[in-house]
């Protein structure tokens, strides 16, 4: 039995997979911030997790996926205000009783040190210093990501 959050995540991911392939992104569009091989868009409004997921999809992107602790730290370094929380693309899968990224993979327990409970309707947010489990209905900001296509001798936009 999948929760409504899980269904929403699966539906959006499937619809993204059906869309026509676009040419690779060589540098970040205006208003997006480059972090290594990704372009990030930090929202300036707030939404529950599933609305944030949908918003990223309309922007032909996804909620942020964090590969490892190093990427987490680099992302957190971009957050100026200690008090602001941002949704990322990780929520609790009730059926698998585990944290699951929106791309279908499970969280490696060593990657993130999550503060809070792993339970139904829990989604993950990050702040400048920490990673939190929050009710998915909580209205906070979010981070969308686009992957850059690696090219040699790339000129990076302003940082």
């Amino acid at each position: 039995q999948k929760s409504s959050i899980e269904k929403c995540s699966v539906d959006i991911q499937q619809s993204r997979n059906k869309t026509t392939e676009r040419p690779g992104l060589l540098n970040c569009p205006i208003y997006w911030q480059q972090l290594r091989e990704k372009c990030l868009l930090f929202s300036h409004t707030v939404n529950p997790w599933n609305n944030s997921l949908a918003d990223c999809s309309t922007k032909e992107s996804s909620l942020l996926l964090i590969r490892d602790k190093d990427e987490l730290i680099h992302t957190q370094n971009l957050i100026r205000d200690k008090a602001i929380l941002f949704w990322i693309g990780l929520n609790f899968s009730l059926s698998e009783k585990n944290w699951k990224w929106i791309n279908g993979s499970f969280l490696n327990s060593n990657d993130l040190e999550i503060r809070g409970d792993a339970k139904e309707n829990s989604c993950i947010s990050i702040s400048q210093t920490s990673v939190y489990s929050e009710y998915c209905s909580t209205e906070i900001r979010w981070i969308c990501q686009k992957e850059l296509t690696p090219v040699r001798n790339k000129v990076y936009p302003d940082s």
């Epitope: 676009r22 309309t58 922007k59 205000d81």
Partner: antibody, heavy 116, light 111 residues
Framework: QVQLQESGPGLVKPSETLSLTCTVS????????WSWIRQPPGRGLEWIGY???????NYNPSLKSRVTISLDTSKNQFSLKLNSVTAADTAVYYC??????????WGQGTLVTVSS | DIVMTQTPLSSPVTLGQPASISCRSS???????????LSWLQQRPGQPPRLLIY???NRFSGVPDRFSGSGAGTDFTLKISRVEAEDVGVYYC????????FGQGTRLEIK
Amino acid sequence: QVQLQESGPGLVKPSETLSLTCTVSGGSISSYYWSWIRQPPGRGLEWIGYIYYIGSTNYNPSLKSRVTISLDTSKNQFSLKLNSVTAADTAVYYCARDMMGALDYWGQGTLVTVSS
Amino acid sequence: DIVMTQTPLSSPVTLGQPASISCRSSESLVHSDGNTYLSWLQQRPGQPPRLLIYKISNRFSGVPDRFSGSGAGTDFTLKISRVEAEDVGVYYCMQAAQFPTFGQGTRLEIK
């Protein structure tokens, strides 16, 4: 209601640095993009650059080598520095809030004249 | 750079009559996020610009409904259904698909 107010010297000597500050009231600077735009007397508008609330910047390529925009969240201000100015930099300088391509709130503008 | 070209550069209009301003971009304004960041600004004499329309057709808060925007791709139009005396000024289109650029402006004046 968000309000923006530019401040800084109205006269700058050639080759010196133009420095302006924009103070934001009625809303927090810890959101959105914050832009500088200029308008030479009797002419059209030119975008100078923006700073995002997380501190990253993007500049007009034609001015990029001379421009720095910075942010002070504690004072709810953002600033423009344009170095090595010439008479061609004489303009009314505006600050504005940028909602991803929609400049929705503007300051009244401040005229900066470059002259010796 | 994306070049924005407005026509006409000057538009004398009779009060109560409609007015239309065209804006053409040198390339498509569809951003890689799927949105089209084309806005229209009004600058009355001696005042800063004021946002009228954003993302082609969305009226900004407080803007009278006689102002409307339309278009797609590279061709965009601002329409004023019935011109009023307070509409006098210069109108600019602006794109933000890449770094923002403005049209050269269209001066609206009363006949």
